[in-house]
Protein backbone atom coordinates (compact mmCIF):
# COMPACT_ATOMS: atom_id res chain seq x y z
CA UNK A 1 0.00 0.00 0.00
CA UNK A 2 0.91 3.66 0.15
CA UNK A 3 2.75 3.33 3.46
CA UNK A 4 4.92 0.57 2.01
CA UNK A 5 5.70 2.79 -0.99
CA UNK A 6 6.51 5.77 1.24
CA UNK A 7 8.97 3.78 3.33
CA UNK A 8 10.58 2.21 0.27
CA UNK A 9 11.09 5.60 -1.42
CA UNK A 10 12.67 7.03 1.72
CA UNK A 11 14.99 4.07 2.29
CA UNK A 12 16.24 3.96 -1.30
CA UNK A 13 16.41 7.67 -2.20
CA UNK A 14 17.06 9.08 1.27
CA UNK A 15 14.45 11.77 0.56
CA UNK A 16 11.12 12.51 2.22
CA UNK A 17 8.55 10.80 0.00
CA UNK A 18 5.65 13.21 0.47
CA UNK A 19 7.47 16.51 0.18
CA UNK A 20 9.88 15.47 -2.57
CA UNK A 21 7.67 13.24 -4.70
CA UNK A 22 4.09 13.78 -3.54
CA UNK A 23 3.48 16.67 -5.94
CA UNK A 24 6.42 16.44 -8.35
CA UNK A 25 5.81 17.09 -12.04
CA UNK A 26 2.69 15.82 -13.76
CA UNK A 27 2.64 12.21 -12.57
CA UNK A 28 4.18 11.92 -9.11
CA UNK A 29 1.38 11.85 -6.56
CA UNK A 30 -2.31 11.51 -7.32
CA UNK A 31 -3.57 11.42 -10.88
CA UNK A 32 -1.57 12.48 -13.87
CA UNK A 33 -1.99 13.94 -17.34
CA UNK A 34 0.04 15.40 -20.15
CA UNK A 35 3.70 14.78 -20.88
CA UNK A 36 6.06 13.92 -18.01
CA UNK A 37 8.40 16.83 -17.27
CA UNK A 38 11.68 14.92 -16.78
CA UNK A 39 13.23 11.57 -15.86
CA UNK A 40 11.79 11.56 -12.35
CA UNK A 41 8.32 12.31 -13.70
CA UNK A 42 8.71 9.50 -16.26
CA UNK A 43 9.40 7.13 -13.36
CA UNK A 44 6.05 8.10 -11.87
CA UNK A 45 4.32 7.79 -15.25
CA UNK A 46 5.59 4.22 -15.59
CA UNK A 47 4.55 3.49 -12.00
CA UNK A 48 1.01 4.75 -12.67
CA UNK A 49 0.78 2.36 -15.62
CA UNK A 50 2.17 -0.50 -13.53
CA UNK A 51 -0.50 0.13 -10.90
CA UNK A 52 -3.18 0.45 -13.60
CA UNK A 53 -2.38 -3.02 -14.92
CA UNK A 54 -2.63 -4.48 -11.41
CA UNK A 55 -5.96 -2.78 -10.76
CA UNK A 56 -7.31 -4.39 -13.92
CA UNK A 57 -6.25 -7.75 -12.50
CA UNK A 58 -8.15 -7.23 -9.25
CA UNK A 59 -5.52 -5.79 -6.92
CA UNK A 60 -6.51 -2.96 -4.58
CA UNK A 61 -3.40 -0.85 -4.97
CA UNK A 62 -4.24 1.66 -2.24
CA UNK A 63 -4.99 -0.74 0.60
CA UNK A 64 -3.06 -3.88 -0.41
CA UNK A 65 0.06 -4.14 1.71
CA UNK A 66 3.15 -6.29 1.27
CA UNK A 67 6.43 -7.05 2.99
CA UNK A 68 9.90 -6.29 1.69
CA UNK A 69 13.45 -6.30 2.98
CA UNK A 70 16.00 -3.55 2.45
CA UNK A 71 19.70 -4.21 2.90
CA UNK A 72 22.78 -2.66 1.32
CA UNK A 73 20.63 -0.56 -1.01
CA UNK A 74 18.77 -3.60 -2.34
CA UNK A 75 15.00 -4.06 -2.09
CA UNK A 76 13.81 -7.66 -1.93
CA UNK A 77 10.09 -8.36 -2.17
CA UNK A 78 9.03 -11.13 0.20
CA UNK A 79 6.91 -14.08 -0.94
CA UNK A 80 3.17 -13.55 -0.98
CA UNK A 81 0.07 -13.69 -3.13
CA UNK A 82 0.02 -12.33 -6.67
CA UNK A 83 -1.02 -8.81 -5.66
CA UNK A 84 1.61 -8.55 -2.92
CA UNK A 85 4.45 -9.66 -5.17
CA UNK A 86 3.46 -7.55 -8.15
CA UNK A 87 2.59 -4.42 -6.18
CA UNK A 88 5.97 -4.64 -4.49
CA UNK A 89 7.62 -5.13 -7.90
CA UNK A 90 5.93 -1.96 -9.24
CA UNK A 91 7.14 0.01 -6.23
CA UNK A 92 10.65 -1.44 -6.42
CA UNK A 93 10.94 -0.41 -10.09
CA UNK A 94 9.77 3.08 -9.18
CA UNK A 95 12.23 3.63 -6.34
CA UNK A 96 15.20 2.38 -8.35
CA UNK A 97 14.11 4.69 -11.16
CA UNK A 98 13.80 7.64 -8.77
CA UNK A 99 17.26 6.89 -7.42
CA UNK A 100 18.75 6.78 -10.94
CA UNK A 101 17.24 10.20 -11.61
CA UNK A 102 18.26 11.91 -8.36
CA UNK A 103 20.93 13.96 -10.13
CA UNK A 104 18.40 15.49 -12.51
CA UNK A 105 15.80 16.13 -9.77
CA UNK A 106 14.51 19.63 -10.44
CA UNK A 107 13.17 21.62 -7.44
CA UNK A 108 11.16 23.70 -9.94
CA UNK A 109 8.93 20.66 -10.48
CA UNK A 110 8.60 19.79 -6.79
CA UNK A 111 5.18 21.40 -6.39
CA UNK A 112 4.21 21.59 -10.04
CA UNK A 113 0.67 22.87 -10.71
CA UNK A 114 -1.42 20.22 -12.49
CA UNK A 115 -3.01 22.88 -14.63
CA UNK A 116 0.31 23.28 -16.45
CA UNK A 117 0.30 19.60 -17.49
CA UNK A 118 -1.01 19.08 -21.01
Amino acid sequence: GLLDLKSMIEKVTGKNALTNYGFYGCYCGWGGRGTPKDGTDWCCWAHDHCYGRLEEKGCNIRTQSYKYRFAWGVVTCEPGPFCHVNLCACDRKLVYCLKRNLRSYNPQYQYFPNILCS
Partner: antibody, heavy 116, light 106 residues
Framework: EVQLQLSGADLVKPGASVKLSCTAS????????IHWVKQRPEPGLEWIGR????????KYDPKFQGKATITADTSSNTAYLQLTSLTSEDTAVYYC?????????WGQGTTLTVSS | QIVLTQSPAIMSASPGEKVTMTCSAS?????MYWYQQKPGSSPRLLIY???NLASGVPVRFSGSGSGTSYSLTISRMEAEDAATYYC?????????FGAGTKLELK
Amino acid sequence: EVQLQLSGADLVKPGASVKLSCTASGFNIKDSYIHWVKQRPEPGLEWIGRIDPANGNTKYDPKFQGKATITADTSSNTAYLQLTSLTSEDTAVYYCARDVVALDYWGQGTTLTVSS
Amino acid sequence: QIVLTQSPAIMSASPGEKVTMTCSASSSVSYMYWYQQKPGSSPRLLIYDTSNLASGVPVRFSGSGSGTSYSLTISRMEAEDAATYYCQQWSSYPLTFGAGTKLELK
Protein backbone atom coordinates in the same frame (compact mmCIF):
# COMPACT_ATOMS: atom_id res chain seq x y z
CA GLU B 1 -18.20 -15.72 -12.82
CA VAL B 2 -14.78 -17.12 -11.90
CA GLN B 3 -14.59 -20.90 -12.27
CA LEU B 4 -11.87 -23.55 -12.34
CA GLN B 5 -12.79 -26.85 -13.96
CA LEU B 6 -10.61 -29.86 -13.15
CA SER B 7 -10.28 -33.03 -15.19
CA GLY B 8 -7.90 -35.88 -15.91
CA ALA B 9 -7.87 -37.87 -12.68
CA ASP B 10 -8.96 -41.48 -12.67
CA LEU B 11 -7.98 -44.93 -11.51
CA VAL B 12 -4.38 -45.44 -12.62
CA LYS B 13 -1.80 -48.15 -12.09
CA PRO B 14 1.35 -47.75 -9.95
CA GLY B 15 4.32 -46.52 -11.96
CA ALA B 16 2.13 -44.70 -14.49
CA SER B 17 1.91 -40.96 -15.08
CA VAL B 18 -1.11 -38.69 -15.16
CA LYS B 19 -1.76 -35.14 -16.34
CA LEU B 20 -4.48 -33.16 -14.59
CA SER B 21 -5.94 -30.09 -16.25
CA CYS B 22 -7.48 -26.98 -14.73
CA THR B 23 -9.44 -24.85 -17.18
CA ALA B 24 -10.31 -21.34 -16.05
CA SER B 25 -13.31 -19.27 -17.06
CA GLY B 26 -14.36 -15.78 -15.99
CA PHE B 27 -10.76 -14.53 -15.83
CA ASN B 28 -7.48 -14.74 -17.71
CA ILE B 29 -4.93 -17.02 -16.03
CA LYS B 30 -2.18 -14.58 -17.09
CA ASP B 31 -3.66 -12.15 -14.56
CA SER B 32 -2.97 -14.43 -11.59
CA TYR B 33 -0.87 -17.33 -10.37
CA ILE B 34 -2.28 -20.86 -10.41
CA HIS B 35 -1.52 -23.22 -7.53
CA TRP B 36 -1.98 -26.96 -7.08
CA VAL B 37 -2.88 -28.47 -3.71
CA LYS B 38 -3.13 -32.11 -2.66
CA GLN B 39 -5.54 -33.31 0.01
CA ARG B 40 -5.54 -36.61 1.89
CA PRO B 41 -7.21 -37.39 5.23
CA GLU B 42 -3.69 -37.28 6.70
CA PRO B 43 -1.75 -34.93 6.55
CA GLY B 44 -4.54 -32.74 5.09
CA LEU B 45 -3.84 -29.93 2.65
CA GLU B 46 -0.40 -30.01 1.05
CA TRP B 47 0.85 -27.32 -1.32
CA ILE B 48 2.45 -28.81 -4.44
CA GLY B 49 3.50 -25.66 -6.26
CA ARG B 50 2.42 -22.77 -8.42
CA ILE B 51 2.93 -21.26 -11.85
CA ASP B 52 2.96 -17.72 -13.15
CA PRO B 53 1.21 -18.35 -16.49
CA ALA B 54 2.40 -14.99 -17.86
CA ASN B 55 6.01 -16.21 -18.00
CA GLY B 56 5.95 -19.90 -17.05
CA ASN B 57 7.90 -19.39 -13.81
CA THR B 58 7.20 -22.13 -11.28
CA LYS B 59 7.82 -22.81 -7.60
CA TYR B 60 7.48 -26.20 -5.94
CA ASP B 61 7.51 -27.70 -2.49
CA PRO B 62 10.85 -29.59 -2.49
CA LYS B 63 8.87 -32.67 -1.47
CA PHE B 64 7.14 -32.67 -4.88
CA GLN B 65 10.18 -31.73 -6.97
CA GLY B 66 10.71 -34.52 -9.48
CA LYS B 67 7.22 -35.89 -8.81
CA ALA B 68 5.17 -32.96 -10.08
CA THR B 69 5.47 -30.67 -13.10
CA ILE B 70 3.23 -27.62 -13.46
CA THR B 71 2.66 -26.01 -16.85
CA ALA B 72 0.18 -23.61 -18.37
CA ASP B 73 -1.27 -22.88 -21.80
CA THR B 74 -2.54 -19.30 -21.90
CA SER B 75 -4.22 -19.79 -25.29
CA SER B 76 -6.62 -22.32 -23.77
CA ASN B 77 -6.61 -20.63 -20.33
CA THR B 78 -5.57 -23.94 -18.78
CA ALA B 79 -3.01 -25.01 -16.18
CA TYR B 80 -1.70 -28.57 -15.89
CA LEU B 81 -0.24 -30.78 -13.20
CA GLN B 82 1.72 -33.82 -14.35
CA LEU B 83 2.50 -36.51 -11.77
CA THR B 84 4.97 -39.27 -12.57
CA SER B 85 5.97 -42.65 -11.10
CA LEU B 86 2.66 -42.90 -9.28
CA THR B 87 2.35 -44.83 -6.01
CA SER B 88 -0.45 -45.32 -3.50
CA GLU B 89 0.87 -42.20 -1.71
CA ASP B 90 -0.35 -40.16 -4.67
CA THR B 91 -3.94 -41.27 -4.10
CA ALA B 92 -5.67 -38.03 -3.11
CA VAL B 93 -7.98 -35.23 -4.12
CA TYR B 94 -6.15 -32.59 -6.17
CA TYR B 95 -7.21 -28.96 -6.39
CA CYS B 96 -6.12 -26.06 -8.52
CA ALA B 97 -6.62 -22.59 -7.10
CA ARG B 98 -6.38 -19.06 -8.40
CA ASP B 99 -4.08 -16.67 -6.57
CA VAL B 100 -4.80 -12.95 -6.75
CA VAL B 101 -5.15 -11.72 -3.16
CA ALA B 102 -4.81 -15.27 -1.79
CA LEU B 103 -6.06 -18.68 -2.95
CA ASP B 104 -9.33 -16.95 -3.67
CA TYR B 105 -11.03 -19.43 -6.01
CA TRP B 106 -10.62 -23.20 -5.98
CA GLY B 107 -11.54 -25.88 -8.48
CA GLN B 108 -14.01 -28.55 -7.42
CA GLY B 109 -11.28 -31.11 -6.80
CA THR B 110 -10.50 -34.25 -8.76
CA THR B 111 -9.83 -37.64 -7.19
CA LEU B 112 -6.81 -39.64 -8.30
CA THR B 113 -6.71 -43.27 -7.24
CA VAL B 114 -3.51 -45.27 -7.72
CA SER B 115 -4.13 -48.98 -7.52
CA SER B 116 -3.19 -52.13 -9.35
CA GLN C 1 9.64 -24.92 6.30
CA ILE C 2 7.20 -23.11 8.57
CA VAL C 3 4.94 -25.46 10.56
CA LEU C 4 1.47 -24.21 11.47
CA THR C 5 -0.20 -25.74 14.52
CA GLN C 6 -3.94 -25.27 14.88
CA SER C 7 -5.81 -25.63 18.12
CA PRO C 8 -8.09 -27.07 19.13
CA ALA C 9 -8.19 -29.93 16.62
CA ILE C 10 -11.92 -30.38 17.22
CA MET C 11 -14.42 -28.11 18.95
CA SER C 12 -18.17 -27.68 19.18
CA ALA C 13 -20.30 -24.61 19.66
CA SER C 14 -23.98 -23.79 20.08
CA PRO C 15 -25.79 -21.35 17.78
CA GLY C 16 -25.10 -17.77 18.88
CA GLU C 17 -21.95 -18.72 20.76
CA LYS C 18 -18.62 -16.93 20.15
CA VAL C 19 -15.96 -19.19 18.66
CA THR C 20 -12.20 -18.61 18.61
CA MET C 21 -9.57 -20.90 17.12
CA THR C 22 -5.84 -20.32 16.94
CA CYS C 23 -2.96 -20.95 14.58
CA SER C 24 0.62 -20.94 15.87
CA ALA C 25 3.57 -20.66 13.48
CA SER C 26 6.97 -22.26 14.13
CA SER C 27 8.59 -18.97 13.09
CA SER C 28 7.31 -15.46 12.53
CA VAL C 29 5.04 -14.86 9.53
CA SER C 30 3.86 -11.57 8.04
CA TYR C 31 0.26 -12.50 7.33
CA MET C 32 -2.13 -15.38 7.89
CA TYR C 33 -4.82 -16.71 5.57
CA TRP C 34 -7.89 -18.71 6.61
CA TYR C 35 -10.02 -21.15 4.62
CA GLN C 36 -13.27 -22.96 5.36
CA GLN C 37 -13.98 -26.43 4.02
CA LYS C 38 -17.21 -28.39 4.27
CA PRO C 39 -17.34 -32.16 3.57
CA GLY C 40 -17.35 -32.90 -0.15
CA SER C 41 -16.54 -29.28 -1.07
CA SER C 42 -13.45 -27.30 -1.99
CA PRO C 43 -11.79 -24.95 0.49
CA ARG C 44 -13.16 -21.41 0.45
CA LEU C 45 -11.15 -18.29 1.26
CA LEU C 46 -12.43 -16.53 4.39
CA ILE C 47 -9.68 -14.16 5.53
CA TYR C 48 -6.65 -12.80 3.72
CA ASP C 49 -3.76 -10.66 4.96
CA THR C 50 -4.58 -11.66 8.56
CA SER C 51 -7.73 -9.58 8.95
CA ASN C 52 -9.32 -8.79 5.57
CA LEU C 53 -12.64 -10.45 4.85
CA ALA C 54 -12.86 -12.16 1.47
CA SER C 55 -15.70 -11.27 -0.86
CA GLY C 56 -19.07 -12.65 0.26
CA VAL C 57 -17.88 -13.75 3.70
CA PRO C 58 -20.27 -12.80 6.56
CA VAL C 59 -19.03 -10.07 8.91
CA ARG C 60 -19.33 -12.42 11.90
CA PHE C 61 -15.94 -13.81 10.80
CA SER C 62 -12.80 -11.92 11.78
CA GLY C 63 -9.09 -12.59 11.90
CA SER C 64 -6.29 -11.14 13.98
CA GLY C 65 -2.76 -11.76 15.18
CA SER C 66 0.89 -11.12 14.38
CA GLY C 67 4.27 -12.81 14.52
CA THR C 68 3.72 -16.44 15.43
CA SER C 69 0.22 -16.21 16.91
CA TYR C 70 -2.98 -15.79 14.90
CA SER C 71 -6.66 -16.41 15.49
CA LEU C 72 -9.98 -16.72 13.66
CA THR C 73 -13.14 -15.64 15.49
CA ILE C 74 -16.80 -16.21 14.70
CA SER C 75 -18.76 -13.68 16.74
CA ARG C 76 -21.99 -15.70 16.73
CA MET C 77 -21.96 -19.32 15.63
CA GLU C 78 -24.49 -20.34 12.99
CA ALA C 79 -25.38 -23.85 11.82
CA GLU C 80 -23.80 -23.21 8.39
CA ASP C 81 -20.43 -22.47 10.07
CA ALA C 82 -19.93 -26.15 10.95
CA ALA C 83 -16.85 -27.00 8.88
CA THR C 84 -13.10 -27.51 9.04
CA TYR C 85 -10.99 -24.34 9.14
CA TYR C 86 -7.41 -24.19 7.84
CA CYS C 87 -4.78 -21.51 8.34
CA GLN C 88 -2.07 -20.95 5.72
CA GLN C 89 1.13 -18.91 5.58
CA TRP C 90 2.84 -17.24 2.62
CA SER C 91 5.91 -15.74 4.27
CA SER C 92 8.27 -18.37 2.97
CA TYR C 93 8.19 -21.16 0.44
CA PRO C 94 6.92 -23.80 0.53
CA LEU C 95 3.45 -22.54 1.42
CA THR C 96 2.12 -24.51 4.36
CA PHE C 97 -1.29 -25.20 5.87
CA GLY C 98 -2.31 -26.05 9.38
CA ALA C 99 -3.87 -29.47 10.03
CA GLY C 100 -7.25 -27.82 10.53
CA THR C 101 -9.76 -27.17 13.29
CA LYS C 102 -13.02 -29.07 12.93
CA LEU C 103 -15.92 -26.99 14.22
CA GLU C 104 -19.08 -28.92 15.00
CA LEU C 105 -22.55 -27.69 15.90
CA LYS C 106 -23.52 -28.50 19.48
